[in-house]
Every structure is written in C-alpha cells, then in structure tokens.
C-alpha cells in the first residue's frame, strides 16, 4: 500500500532509505534534453518473493532531439555522485545496505538519469535522518521515520532529531561500522 504523504521535513537534515520495501516505485526520470524511450517503463518497481527482491523494469533515456538512440543502464564513475529527490530524498549507494528480506537495494544509476530521484514509498518503509554538514544531531530518540497506516490513512512517524550548531555531520546507521539496518515495521493496519 502506497504512502500517500511524505516523510517529515526536519530543519537542517536529510533522510534516506537503507533499503526499499517491496512495492516501492521509482520514477523513470531523465535529465534535461532527454526523455524516456517510447514505450519505456514509467517506473521501476521493487518486487520479489520470500527469498529475493529486485527492481522490475529498466529506465531508459534517449535524446529529445533524436528518435531512436536509446541509452541504457551503464553506470559511469562520475555518475555515482549523491542525488536527492524532489519528493522522497534518498542519496545514491548508501555505505551499508543489509540484505533485508522483502527489500531492494538502491538501484544503480541509468545513463542520462535526472539529477533527482522520485520514490514512492509503501507502508512499513523506514527512512533515516542525518544532519547536513555544519550541524550537529541532538537525539531525543531514534532519528528515523516509519510510514504507518491507521483507519486507511497513511502517516510518517516523527523522527526524534534536532540539528543544531556548527559541528561535524552525524552519520546514518551503518556508516560508523557495518551492521544490519533495522527492518521496517510490518505492513499492517495499525489498530484503531
């Protein structure tokens, strides 16, 4: 079930998912001057069975000027830079992405991909927050947010994070030492 709202915005902080729950959709967006190939996929979709999850469909971009040249997934080293999204922030290639059952890893970039990724999360997805450079994290609790559903309405829990002052950046889970990121809450209706 899709989350019909966005993770909370925390001043001076960004968020990302360590892994994506099955059902997550990623828009196939192309950078300026390029467009999706005709009959190309609109979205990549995280799908799978009990043992393995992967991204279905392939995003392909072609030059808006030419008709038939297709550009497929060929990651270039210079393309591995961090990307943020309009709707759902999630930088590329997190350091630690545990192979959680029912989750997909960050998809590799495709050629001429837009600079911003737009994810559509599902109920049970967890995202993690960190303070931007120059701000220090004051934790009152977990710096994470989970999409939950109650009475058919979706909402993200409020992360217990305040970013303050002029200090070194805090880190996402797993960036200090490798460890499995916590599994997202089960996708079920919260009791009313």
């Amino acid at each position: 079930e899709l989350c019909d709202d966005d993770p909370p915005e925390i001043p001076h902080a960004t968020f990302k998912a360590m892994a994506y729950k099955e059902g997550t959709m990623l828009n196939c967006e192309c950078k300026r001057g390029f467009r999706r190939i005709k009959s190309g996929s609109l979205y990549m979709l995280c799908t799978g069975n009990s043992s393995h999850s992967s991204w279905d469909n392939q995003c392909q971009c072609t030059s808006s000027a030419t008709r038939n040249t297709t550009k497929q997934v060929t990651p270039q080293p210079e393309e591995q830079k961090e990307r943020k999204t309009t709707e759902m922030q999630s930088p590329m290639q997190p350091v630690d992405q545990a192979s959680l059952p029912g989750h997909c890893r960050e998809p590799p970039p495709w050629e001429n991909e837009a600079t911003e990724r737009i994810y559509h999360f599902v109920v049970g997805q967890m995202v993690y927050y960190q303070c931007v450079q120059g701000y220090r994290a004051l934790h009152r609790g977990p710096a994470e947010s989970v999409c939950k559903m109650t009475h058919g309405k979706t909402r993200w829990t409020q992360p217990q994070l305040i970013c303050t002052g002029e200090m070194e950046t805090s880190q996402f889970p797993g960036e200090e030492k490798p460890q499995a990121s916590p599994e997202g809450r089960p996708e079920s209706e919260t009791s009313c």
């Epitope: 079930e1 019909d4 709202d5 109920v123 559903m149 309405k153 996708e187």
Partner: antibody
Framework: QVQLVQSGAEVKKPGSSVKVSCKAS????????MHWVRQAPGQGLEWIGY????????EYNQKFKDKATITADESTNTAYMELSSLRSEDTAVYYC?????????WGQGTLVTVSS | DIQMTQSPSTLSASVGDRVTITCSAS?????MHWYQQKPGKAPKLLIY???NLASGVPARFSGSGSGTEFTLTISSLQPDDFATYYC?????????FGQGTKVEVK
C-alpha cells in the same frame, strides 16, 4: 467539518481548455495530497493524478499526462485541474478527493461538457 | 497497470437478500478498498483496507479477501443499499478502480 467545494458545470467547445477548482476547508490543506478522479457518463471511475499542495509536486496517470495539469494555491486552500485540447471524449464529471490514504472526502463533482 | 475486474456488472436483488460482489486484481495487492455511489452523487468510502468499515457504515456490510481476490458482502440488503459499488487499489500507480457493480431492484 471537512469540505471540498468544486466549481460549477462548464460547457466548452472542442479544442478549448477548462480549469476546474476545488476549495478545501475544515483541515490543513497542505497536510494532504489532493487527487482528481474522472467519471465519464455511465462509466466507472478513473484516477487522473494528485498534487502535494505544500511542494507543488504532481504525479499523473500517464493516460492524462498531456490532458490534465494539476495546481494548487496554498493562500486560498484551492486545488485546480486544467484540461486542455478538449474533445467530446473529455465530457465527464471530474471529482477532487482528499488523499493521505483512502479517499475519505470528495468534492461534489464538476460536469464538463464538450460540444460544438 | 493493475486491472480490476468486478463481477457481476449488474446484480438484481430484493430487500433482505444476501449480496456478494467480487473484485479480481490482475496482480497481487496489499489491500482492497470499496466505495458506494448513488446517481448524481460523489462516491462514498464504504470499506477500507479490505475489511474495515468506514465511519457510519452499517455492520451489514463486510469485506474480505487477499492477494488478487476480494469480496464485498451485504448480509441483508436494505432499500438504501441500491447503488453502484466500486473496488479500488492503491498499492501501485496508477491507482485504479473496478468498472463498478450496479445493485438494482429485482
């Protein structure tokens, strides 16, 4: 109480455009996406797309990508949907519906008739 | 796109009858939602997340199912229940609805 009040019925010529409004009250407008749904005469419901009023971000059903443009005005708590290059097949009732999950509140609908 | 197929398209029934409407999704979905619509009116949320009754909906309505097969049941049809019913999925974009089932007087 939550209310979504839509603009009145419109009769338009083929090739023209129309802008339907949906004024929200009784809740925080920017806290919920606003979705639009079409119902052609005697037909079922079709999802057109949504807008996130706080960011202006839109997502469309590909079928309506070149037909509908959804916007929102935070200052008046109003969502809009403009339909362009109208054809007779666009004759339908257009509904706005509050998102955030299931559509628990709907506008009363706006009938757009396209006729020469 | 996930196609939603409702059956039957039209159902003729009498007050007091037990009525069952089925909805099949072309792919597995998390939940099904159901709306009721009367002529000239906007749809009204009836059942959300497969089996939960929306506020003010009588207990004679119930929903069940999982995966690709879902059911809406009215245990004892009342005069106010003659309407068109739509199933709806919001597990993936584009969001889709069934074509509708019209419950009419026999």
């Amino acid at each position: 109480q939550v209310q979504l009040v839509q603009s009145g019925a419109e009769v338009k010529k083929p090739g023209s455009s129309v802008k339907v409004s949906c004024k929200a009250s009784g809740y925080t407008f920017t806290s919920y996406r606003m979705h639009w749904v079409r119902q052609a005469p005697g037909q079922g419901l079709e999802w057109i797309g949504y807008i996130n009023p706080s960011k202006g971000y839109t997502e469309y059903n590909q079928k309506f990508k070149d037909k509908a443009t959804i916007t929102a005005d935070e200052s008046t708590n109003t969502a809009y949907m403009e339909l362009s290059s109208l054809r007779s097949e666009d004759t339908a009732v257009y509904y706005c519906a509050r998102g955030g999950g299931v559509f628990d509140y709907w506008g009363q609908g706006t009938l757009v008739t396209v006729s020469s | 796109d996930i196609q939603m197929t409702q059956s039957p398209s039209t159902l003729s029934a009498s007050v007091g009858d037990r009525v069952t409407i089925t909805c099949s999704a072309s792919s597995s979905i998390s939940y099904m939602h159901w709306y009721q619509q009367k002529p000239g009116k906007a749809p009204k949320l009836l059942i959300y997340t497969t089996s939960n009754l929306a506020s003010g909906v009588p207990a004679r309505f119930s929903g069940s199912g999982s995966g690709t097969e879902f059911t809406l049941t009215i245990s004892s049809l009342q005069p106010d229940d003659f309407a068109t019913y739509y199933c709806h999925q919001r597990s993936t974009y584009p969001l889709t609805f069934g074509q509708g089932t019209k419950v009419e007087v026999k």
